[in-house]
């Protein structure tokens, strides 16, 4: 028996859905009572679901797991996950045994979008040219950690004086903080970009300076 | 007939090497999973190790997980039992298994194995 | 892993009774479960896989019954080759195989 799975990893989104791929060749005259399938972490080694016996016997892995029953027997032994979470990310090995065993690794990938960004100004009045500001570029939610860049108004990147922080949430969302520092000049953009780097999601946000008033 | 025949056990100082061999007969050997089981003196029967028909998948004990290597050579039928960082506690006789669905259905005369400094 | 205790440790019968050799599992492996004949000296039979299954050639003296988590292997009428030390090993979880500590059946 020889066992295939996706070489790329599987990306899926938090709180949706995922099937992480296994298939066989089953030889002619095969039955499901020959089938012994266990999916497991890769890492820990814990189950995560199993078929044996001609008998799905259910998910180990917080009762969100199911396989495809009416696609076994053609080699289908797929498995899907139900509402994913940040901490399913990682590596399933699917083993597959009908007479002989074979195994194979497929890697899933969590992501979240980032939110649209919001721009605070600190100080955000009476503002002159040569003033230093701090602008705070926040987005929220997402995974895995941000790239995030900052740009002038002509598309200069800045790079100096920028503090970026992100913490994650209880269910492993990171929030993003960049810190720019800056000496206003006589008018100015300044643009943040946050990217997810799995799902190449852009989310920009920017503030305009003028004499007065301020533009977000 | 099916026929298993070890080979390569003898006697070897902790912290040594030591390699067997299994010659396979009798059946089409890239067809079934093989295995490794040991036999401590006077003691039961313990599961080492197993290696797919192909050849792509390996399983291991945990007691000799990242010091033994199963591997297998279809084109002269042989398993091989790579047993590196022996231990006292790997004394045993060493038998090859044909498997079939998990269950061994032939096994070999098995070749001992002695840890002893 | 599956833990499988054998009893009784030793059984002692004269030929032509019934022996009656248990196995319990730590948890269900339905009938995922074989049985082993190892006489002495030699090297370990299958008897019996699929918890009732007879292997090839083993005569019908030998059965096996159970599921789940207790196993029997009965001998129906012990003859003098019938003393051993049997082994049962399950493969329900079959990335970590197991085997039961043995039950030796001596001559009475």
């Known amino acids: 028996v020889e066992v295939q799975v996706s070489e790329d990893p599987v990306v899926a989104l938090v709180d949706t859905d995922a099937t992480l791929r296994c298939s066989f060749s089953p030889e002619p005259g095969f039955s499901l009572a020959q089938l012994n399938l266990i999916w497991q972490l890769t890492d820990t080694k814990q189950l995560v679901h199993s078929f044996t016996e001609g008998r799905d016997q259910g998910s180990a892995y917080s009762n969100r797991t199911a396989l495809f029953p009416d696609l076994l027997v053609q080699g289908n032994a797929s498995l899907r996950l139900q509402r994913v979470r940040v901490t399913d990310e990682g590596s399933y090995t699917c083993f597959v045994s009908i007479q002989d065993f074979d195994s194979a690794a497929v890697s899933l990938q969590v992501a979240a979008p980032y939110s649209k960004p919001s721009m605070t100004l600190e100080p955000n009045k009476d503002l002159r040219p040569g003033n230093m500001v701090t602008i705070t570029c926040s987005s929220y939610q997402g995974y895995p950690e941000a790239e995030v860049f900052w740009k002038d108004g002509q598309g200069v990147p800045l790079t100096g004086n920028v503090t970026t922080s992100q913490m994650a949430n209880e269910r492993g969302l990171f929030d993003v903080h960049s810190v720019l520092r800056v000496v206003l000049g006589a008018n100015g953009t300044y643009s943040c970009l946050v990217r997810n780097p799995v799902l190449q999601q852009d989310a920009h946000g920017s503030v305009t300076i003028t004499g007065q008033p301020l533009t977000f | 007939d099916v026929q298993l025949v070890e080979s390569g056990g003898g006697v070897v100082r902790p912290g040594e090497s030591l390699r067997l061999s299994c010659a396979a007969s009798?059946?089409?050997?890239?067809?079934?999973?093989m295995s490794w089981v040991r036999q401590a003196p006077g003691e039961g029967l313990e599961w080492v190790s197993s290696?797919?028909?192909?050849?792509?998948?390996?399983l291991y004990a945990d007691s000799v997980k990242g010091r033994f290597t199963i591997s297998r050579d279809s084109s002269n039928n042989s398993l091989y039992l790579q047993m590196n960082s022996l231990r006292a506690e790997d004394t045993a006789v060493y038998y090859c298994?044909?498997?079939?669905?998990?269950?061994?259905?032939?096994w070999g005369l098995g070749t001992l194995v002695t840890v002893s400094s | 892993e599956i833990v499988l205790t054998q009893s009784p440790g030793t059984l002692t019968l004269s030929p032509g009774e019934r022996a009656t050799l248990s196995c319990r599992a730590s948890?269900?492996?339905?009938?995922?479960l074989a049985w082993y004949q190892q006489r002495p000296g030699q090297t370990p039979r299958l008897l019996i896989y699929?918890?009732?299954s007879r292997a090839t050639g083993i005569p019908d003296r030998f059965s096996g019954s159970g599921s789940g988590t207790e196993f029997t292997l009965t001998i129906s009428s012990l003859q003098s080759e019938d003393f051993a030390v049997y082994y049962c090993?399950?493969?329900?979880?079959?990335?970590?195989?197991?085997f039961g500590g043995g039950t030796k059946v001596e001559i009475k």
């Open positions: 298994a044909k498997a079939r669905n998990n269950f061994f259905d032939y």
């Open positions: 009798g059946f089409t050997f890239s067809s079934y999973a």
């Open positions: 290696i797919s028909g192909s050849g792509g998948s390996t």
């Open positions: 948890r269900s492996i339905l009938t995922s």
């Open positions: 699929g918890a009732n």
């Open positions: 090993q399950q493969y329900y979880d079959w990335l970590t195989i197991t």
